[in-house]
Interface confidence: low
């Protein structure tokens, strides 16, 4: 952090004799510059030069060869790199007075005679004297106006609208300024800016409309920045609404939009005081033609448990707005005949959410479900298979004697979704079959026993076990199981 530059002479203010020369030296730890009262056109007799010295500091000298009333004002020495357009200069100051008996007031530019007052704020009427000792009075149409005076700034106070004149007497001679005109304007310390784009997505040929509204301000410039600006594509309009309060509504219209008009649309408002700025932007996208995107939140094979309540949610992005419908096994879903409902809600401008709701899932709800979204430019669909999961149950367990061969087959029919697995167990000691430890799993690797399994349809399975020869009484158990449960039966 650099310390502030220093100025010689080391004074806050200095009175310089008319037509005499004076110089100001600025010392800094980095390169320094001067800001002084006159504009570049008026400053032909101001010379600024750099000076070498042995202190290791940077030295810049401001020299005035012949001081005049116009040289009265604030001289600021600042570091070059600290200057920004936004902020007041940070540096060291000295105020120079050059009293001139013929020029009581420091000459001003025409715009300085326009004093903008925002609401009931205080303002400065900038009549500055060339001599700090000169008494000054402020007058309007009603007479002398009481206001505090500072010869460096002028009169500070709360002024009503109208013309004001500063009056001074120097050595018995009376001087008057030309009138300062005070204007009252509706303005706020912060810009209340609102942007509205009823749509942010368009397709070729449509008209883009964006509005920006500024509230409680009359003193605003609003600039639009948008992709088609370089081609002058936009039409801007301004509407001033005064009731119930002041509101400036700026509208940008871009007709016959193309894909190239996609991008950021920005409105930047700035107050005429040049200090208060506010900006808002919106991203607009223009598509060659309408589109649809379907994004399901589930897979193409879904399962629901029997009697369960389940929702299937599909996100749809589409423009123009789509019509959304559901099919089951390629037929339109008739909701009032089933405990299935569908709905569509708009989430955002081009985002929709459609839900398929199963109230109490039944076996017959299984099938292929399709969501179809369509608009004038596109059609998209998504199909998934729904399985209603049913716990396994044994429908039938029977045996079949092979007659003289002494062989025997046992058939076990079971159902469930997913399709159940069938396992066989045997108990060779009938008296002990009540004890679970007496049961053993029948292995397929036993040579004289064959086990098979067949599915009859989507949910029914048949298991068979064939004994080549049964020499003693045994008990056989069929165990059918799937994800949701198991059931067994014995023979």
């Amino acid at each position: 952090q650099l310390s502030l530059p220093s100025i010689l002479p080391n004074e806050n203010e200095k009175v310089v004799q008319l037509n005499s020369s004076f110089s100001l030296r600025c010392f800094g730890e980095s390169e320094v510059s001067w800001q002084y009262p006159m504009s570049e056109e008026e400053s032909s007799d101001v010379e600024i030069r750099n000076e070498e010295n042995n202190s290791g500091l940077f030295v810049t000298v401001l020299e005035v060869s012949s001081a005049s009333a116009a040289h009265t004002g604030l001289y600021t020495c600042y570091y070059n790199h600290t200057q920004t357009e936004e902020n007041e200069l940070e540096g060291r100051h000295i105020y120079i007075y050059v009293p001139d008996p013929d020029v009581a007031f420091v000459p001003l530019g025409m715009t300085d005679y326009l004093v903008i007052v925002e609401d009931d704020d205080s303002a400065i009427i900038p009549c500055r004297t060339t001599d700090p000792e000169t008494p000054v009075t402020l007058h309007n149409s009603e007479g002398v106006v009481p206001a505090s005076y500072d010869s460096r700034q002028g009169f500070n106070g709360t002024f009503t609208v109208g013309p004001y004149i500063c009056e001074a007497t120097v050595k018995g001679k009376k001087f008057q300024t030309i009138p300062f005109n005070v204007y009252a304007l509706k303005a706020t310390s912060e810009l209340d800016l609102e942007m509205e784009a009823l749509k942010t997505v368009y397709k070729s040929g449509e008209t883009i409309v964006v509005t920006c509204a500024v509230f409680n301000n009359e003193v605003v410039d609003l600039q639009w920045t948008y992709p088609g600006e370089v081609k002058g594509k936009g039409i801007t309009m301004l509407e001033e609404i005064k009731v119930p309060s002041i509101k400036l509504v700026y509208t940008l219209t871009v007709p016959e939009a193309t894909v190239k008009d996609s991008g950021d649309y920005e409105c930047a408002a700035r107050q005429a005081t040049r200090e208060v700025k506010e900006m808002k932007k919106v991203t607009i996208s223009v598509h060659e033609k309408g589109f649809i995107e379907i994004k399901p939140t589930f897979s193409q094979l879904e399962a629901v448990n029997l009697h369960e309540v389940k929702h299937f949610v599909v996100e749809v992005r589409a423009y123009p707005p789509p019509r959304i419908s559901w099919l089951k096994n390629n037929l339109t879903l008739i909701e009032n005949l089933t405990e299935i409902t569908t709905d569509v809600e708009k989430i955002q401008e081009i985002r929709y959410r459609s839900k398929l709701k199963l109230i109490r899932a039944k076996e017959e709800d299984s099938g292929h479900y399709t969501i179809v979204a369509q608009n004038e430019d596109a059609v998209k669909s998504y199909t998934f298979e729904l399985l209603t999961q049913v716990p396994s149950s044994i429908l039938d367990l029977v045996d079949d004697h092979h007659g003289s061969t002494g062989g025997q087959t046992v058939r076990c029919t079971a159902e469930g979704t997913p399709l159940p697995d069938i396992e066989w167990m045997i108990c060779k000691d009938i008296k002990k079959c009540n004890n679970e430890t007496s049961w053993t799993i029948l292995a397929n690797n036993v040579s004289n026993i064959i086990t098979e399994i067949h599915s009859r349809d989507r949910s029914t399975v048949e298991g068979r076990v064939t004994f080549a020869k049964v020499e003693e009484t045994i008990a056989v158990r069929c165990l059918a199981k799937n994800l949701l449960g198991a059931e067994n039966r014995e023979l």
Epitope: S39, E40, D221, Q223, A272
Partner: antibody
Framework: DVQLQESGPGLVKPSQSLSLTCTVT?????????WNWIRQFPGNKLEWVGY???????SYNPSLKSRISITRDTSKNQFFLQLNSVTTEDTATYYC??????????????WGAGTTVTVSS | DIQMNQSPSSLSASLGDTITITCHAS??????LTWYQQKPGNIPKLLIY???NLHTGVPSRFSGSGSGTGFTLTISSLQPEDIATYYC?????????FGGGTKLEIK
């Protein structure tokens, strides 16, 4: 006090490009305002050509948009007009002008002296 | 584009007279109208903005009125220095457009 000064060739051949420069003194073109080109045809009709704002954004008259480009050189405090494929219809006095916006309304408050451009073979 | 029609295209009046120039917009431009004065061989100068507001330094004999599509510029007590062409310009929407001008001469 801000001053604007146009410069450029007084004579341009048809189908060639017209290039003009506006040099601004007394005010930085990046500080504020919109910096415009306006032309006045021999019959005295005025036409707004386009602008470049303090931020560098531009806006053009749609009747010229396929042929026009307004750019700037902030280091020289200048802004430029380039008009391509000129015809005799582009013969005019070209003004650069500053657009002010006090009191919630914009208008051209400072104008350059103008430079006359003749399109002729 | 918004068309701006000025009438009359030329006008001859005596010193001290009051004259009126009208400007008609092809669509509603609210109060977004500016008047400029261009003296012979000179550049256009801002006269009146927002239909009725006098620019700083413009004599009070100049006045503007109107809103919507119809606007007038009135010069009372005509002075020799008022010899000029007067233009209206709309600021309602891009592109900004000017009227054809009214040339004022002194009889």
């Amino acid at each position: 006090d801000v001053q604007l000064q146009e410069s450029g060739p007084g004579l341009v051949k048809p189908s060639q490009s017209l290039s003009l420069t506006c040099t601004v003194t007394g005010y930085s073109i990046t500080s504020d305002y919109a910096w415009n080109w306006i032309r006045q045809f021999p019959g005295n009709k005025l036409e707004w050509v386009g602008y470049i704002s303090y931020s560098g954004s531009t806006s053009y008259n749609p009747s010229l948009k396929s042929r026009i480009s307004i750019t700037r050189d902030t280091s020289k405090n200048q802004f430029f007009l380039q008009l391509n494929s000129v015809t005799t219809e582009d013969t005019a006095t070209y003004y650069c002008a500053r657009r002010d916006y006090r009191y919630g309304y914009w208008y051209f408050d400072v104008w350059g002296a103008g430079t006359t451009v003749t399109v002729s073979s | 584009d918004i068309q701006m029609n000025q009438s009359p295209s030329s006008l001859s009046a005596s010193l001290g007279d009051t004259i009126t120039i009208t400007c008609h917009a092809s669509q509603n431009i609210h109060v977004w109208l500016t008047w400029y004065q261009q003296k012979p061989g000179n550049i256009p100068k801002l006269l009146i903005y927002k239909a009725s507001n006098l620019h700083t330094g413009v004599p009070s004999r100049f006045s503007g009125s109107g809103s919507g599509t119809g606007f007038t510029l009135t010069i009372s007590s005509l002075q020799p220095e008022d010899i000029a062409t007067y233009y209206c310009q709309q600021g309602q929407s891009y592109p900004w457009t000017f009227g054809g001008g009214t040339k004022l001469e002194i009889k």
